[in-house]
Interface confidence: low
Amino acid sequence: FERTRSLQDPCSNCPAGTFCDNNRNQICSPCPPNSFSSAGGQRTCDICRQCKGVFRTRKECSSTSNAECDCTPGFHCLGAGCSMCEQDCKQGQELTKKGCKDCCFGTFNDQKRGICRPWTNCSLDGKSVLVNGTKERDVVCGPSPADLSPGASSVTPPAPAREPGHSPQ
């Protein structure tokens, strides 16, 4: 029965960019301005997203696809489809309710977003601090003092920085 009904449903013939207009004998009408339908057979068109305030238009709305927003300079996207914009901070800072604040001693943030994280504790791995940490950079761990005897292998270079956007939020 479902299959028979769908075959007879005139709305199923309405393509994306149109809607099945019940007020006009179920004929396919184009989506009105500032609305869209991304799939066929829809009985209504969805209102286009408006990018306003801190949001900028990255892609205009069309009859078949919604607008896409990104954030104005000084802010970055959060959430699916850039549903929120969050203020950037400088490296060495984190965002708090009172705006961007410097990382406390013993913590760092090497990105414009995210939170300050504790410096690596080199001694947990039996290593020593080769380069001191800063608000912007983690410490660099070197070999333990015992490894620094003549003939010991050279210091392993630090791992490459993490990809942007992968710090815990």
């Epitope: 305030g53 929120m84 705006g99």
Partner: nanobody, 122 residues
């Protein structure tokens, strides 16, 4: 639908005053922190001030502290920004925004007004 409409902007001389208003609708106004932001010509957006839902928690950017006063009237669903001792560097489009996060500058996409222009010039 959330709607925020700013008004009260205009041209004012340095040292002058303006009062901005933001009329809110489509949500329970008293439940939300509200903020003012501004964007000077060719610059990024800057947070100006916020106020908690009940009005008991308030903070200001250092650049406006002592000159600007944020307030709200929950009975009228309105947010205000009283701006005194205005300077040329206060020239900007001012936006009110509903905050859905405890972090300044993190706001839901729809919760912004269209802005009102404040020009401070002699």
């Amino acid at each position: 639908e959330v709607q925020l409409v700013e008004s009260g902007g205009g041209l004012v001389k340095p040292g002058g005053s303006l009062r901005l208003s933001c009329a809110a609708s489509g949500f329970t106004f008293s439940d939300y922190y509200m903020s003012w932001f501004r964007q000077a010509p060719g610059k990024g957006l800057e947070w100006v001030s916020y106020i908690s839902g009940s009005g008991d928690i308030i903070d200001y950017a250092d650049s406006v502290k002592g000159r600007f006063t944020i307030s709200r009237d929950n009975a009228k669903n309105s947010l205000y920004l009283q701006m005194n001792s205005l300077r040329a560097e206060d020239t900007a489009v001012y936006y009110c925004a509903r905050e859905d996060s405890r972090l300044t500058g993190t706001t839901d996409f729809d919760n912004w007004g269209q802005g009102t222009l404040v020009t401070v010039s002699s």
